[in-house]
């Protein structure tokens, strides 16, 4: 059967079901794509205009293809195999009641199945497989592809080899003034700012134009490459570094023994497998942890999560999100949010963006 002959695939959500919040639809669809990108070299990005490879549509009855929907129950959705035009598109029956949970029909689980078709998979005869033809709710927080699903998709696209996963496959030093440069994590350390990318970090001393690039392993040999989040509690001379479900504590620029530890010791639920970004605000003595399109707030004095979290990033940080790469705190009033090659200066007192910059604007580029 057909496959996509490229590894960067775009998708667009044509319209939204009224059954769910738009943010929840975006999140469910993004997480469904992520299920497949986690086990392949494929990368998916959402576009809001123009022609995407995969169009996501909510429709009822006859809707422009040969396969009219049948009302509530029965056929929940269908998707076309890879190709141009309608190829790859995923259609969801609007007569179903779409949900984020076990009631109605779970959009995430259905989307994982349909995206499997969009990528070229047929149905599986293994009842444990997501590509099994009948819908069955499973706990989405512990959802995993079956071995059969993984075998099937990797037979089409291969596995996510390390050099395919890295945006910088040969691990060479990224070009600092590349306008498309993005960062994995950013944090202050005293009067310096550390910018992490792959196995490197740049050191920017405040108000000085000069920056230097270093290997993470040259400063901290016991730490991994690909740091994903970082924050500083300056009053304690502490820096926390995160990768996957682990974190390391650096005190006075030295790694503490008995690390790494699990991020779940902060109180995250089990489905959180990694942190995208983190920032400590000394005025509130709170750390904000950003995970996908949500954030948690952690009380550093009481060493526990504040109640009422997670919350949606887009709801509480106007103009930011739905997802961020990195963030740091500066000048007692700003968060600097990084999204791809863009950076947003955000006044947390006024609660709005005050400046939009390129991510590498700190380096005099």
């Amino acid at each position: 059967g057909p496959v996509w002959r490229k590894h960067y695939i775009t998708y667009r959500i044509n319209n939204y079901t009224p059954d769910m919040n738009r943010e929840d639809v975006d999140y469910a669809i993004r997480k469904a794509f992520q299920v497949w990108s986690n086990v392949t070299p494929l990368k998916f990005s959402k576009i809001n205009t123009g022609m995407a490879d995969i169009l996501v549509v909510f429709a009822r009855g006859a809707h422009g293809d040969f396969h009219a929907f049948d009302g509530k129950g029965g056929i929940l959705a269908h998707a076309f195999g890879p190709g141009s035009g309608i190829g790859g598109d995923a259609h969801f029956d609007e007569d179903e009641f779409w949900t984020t949970h076990s009631g109605g029909t779970n959009l995430f689980l259905t989307a994982v199945h349909e995206i499997g078709h969009s990528l070229g998979l047929g149905h599986s005869s293994d009842p444990k497989a997501v590509m099994f033809p009948t819908y069955k709710y499973v706990d989405i927080n512990t959802f995993r592809l079956s071995a059969d699903d993984i075998r099937g998709i990797q037979s089409l696209y291969g596995d996510p080899k390390e050099n395919q996963r890295l945006p910088n496959p040969d691990n060479s030093e990224p070009a600092l003034c590349d306008p498309n440069l993005s960062f994995d994590a950013v944090t202050t350390v005293g009067n310096k700012i550390f910018f992490f990318k792959d196995r490197f970090f740049w050191l920017k001393v405040s108000e000085r134009p000069k920056t230097s690039v270093n290997l993470i392993s040259s400063l901290w040999p016991t730490l991994p490459s690909g740091i994903e989040a970082a924050y500083e509690i300056e009053a304690r001379n502490q820096v926390f570094l995160f990768k996957d479900d682990k974190y390391w504590l650096i005190s006075n620029l030295r790694p503490e023994p008995n690390y790494p530890k699990s991020i779940h010791s902060f109180g995250f639920p089990n489905f959180v497998k990694k942190i995208d970004a983190a920032v400590f605000n000394p005025r509130f003595y709170r750390t904000y942890f950003f995970v996908d399109n949500q954030y948690w707030r952690y009380d550093e004095r009481r060493q526990m999560m504040d109640p009422g979290y997670p919350k949606l990033i887009t709801k509480n940080f106007q103009g930011i999100g739905p997802k961020i790469d990195a963030v740091f705190y500066s000048k007692n009033k700003y968060y600097y949010f990084f999204q791809g090659s863009n950076q947003f200066e955000y006044d947390f007192l006024l609660q709005r963006i005050t400046k939009t910059l390129k991510s590498n604007s700190w380096f005099g580029c």
């Epitope: 169009l55 809707h63 422009g64 293809d65 040969f66 998707a79 195999g81 035009g85 309608i86 047929g122």
Partner: antibody
């Protein structure tokens, strides 16, 4: 080179039967949806029927449902249309057309045969 | 059920003219619309698929646009070989056709 060649047309009386064939070459026939589209003399195009790559899914226009049967033999790279209870209004040139690969039909007809004329008349 | 309305049903134009044919659906069909050209005694030929994508081998003077319910086929500069009948189509439904004739 993709080629589709229809055969089996001819003159038949109302109420009679006819079986059309479409021989395919130049592509992996068993991967593709296939369709029949017809055109009455001096009129526009009308979709008649479609069949999935394995033959497990078939679709028909309301005007032929219950009278026509689409089928395929992937070992022979051939598409068929069995037409029963023929009526005068079934008189047309019948084209076979190739659609896309995959579990569902896109209705995107990228290759067509030259057609075979079916005339239903007493 | 979805219906397709094509207009005009016939059109007279000269070589070099810019010509536009429209197709309207009675409900959204997203970008799932194709255009075909048919010459007398010949099989139809796919020109445009998915509303705006040019089929391989089709001259660039042909273009398509639209999404939802309203679609357009444009021939930027008519050539003698372009005089034919044009059909829009989505799934099992064809428009009535537009016969393009020499003025």
């Amino acid at each position: 080179e993709v080629q589709l060649l229809e055969s089996g047309g001819g003159l038949v009386q109302p109420g009679g039967s006819l079986r059309l064939s479409c021989a395919a070459s130049g592509f992996t026939f068993s991967d593709y949806w296939m369709h029949w589209v017809r055109q009455a003399p001096g009129k526009g195009l009308e979709w008649v029927s479609g069949i999935s790559p394995s033959g497990g899914m078939t679709m028909y226009a309301d005007s032929v449902k219950g009278r026509f049967t689409i089928s395929r033999d992937n070992s022979k790279n051939t598409l068929y249309l069995q037409m029963n209870s023929l009526r005068a209004e079934d008189t047309a040139v019948y084209y076979c057309a190739r659609d896309i690969v995959g579990p569902y039909s896109a209705g995107l007809f990228d290759y067509w045969g030259r057609g075979t004329l079916v005339t239903v008349s007493s | 059920d979805i219906q397709m309305t094509q207009s005009p049903s016939s059109l007279s134009a000269s070589v070099g003219d810019r010509v536009t044919i429209t197709c309207r659906a009675n409900q959204s069909i997203y970008t799932y619309l194709n255009w075909y050209q048919q010459k007398p005694g010949k099989a139809p030929k796919l020109l445009i698929y998915a509303a705006s994508s040019l089929q391989s081998g089709v001259p660039s003077r042909f273009s398509g646009s639209g999404s939802g319910t309203d679609f357009t086929l444009t021939i930027s500069s008519l050539q003698p070989e372009d005089f034919a009948t044009y059909y829009c189509q989505q799934a099992g439904i064809f428009g009535q056709g537009t016969k393009l004739e020499i003025k």
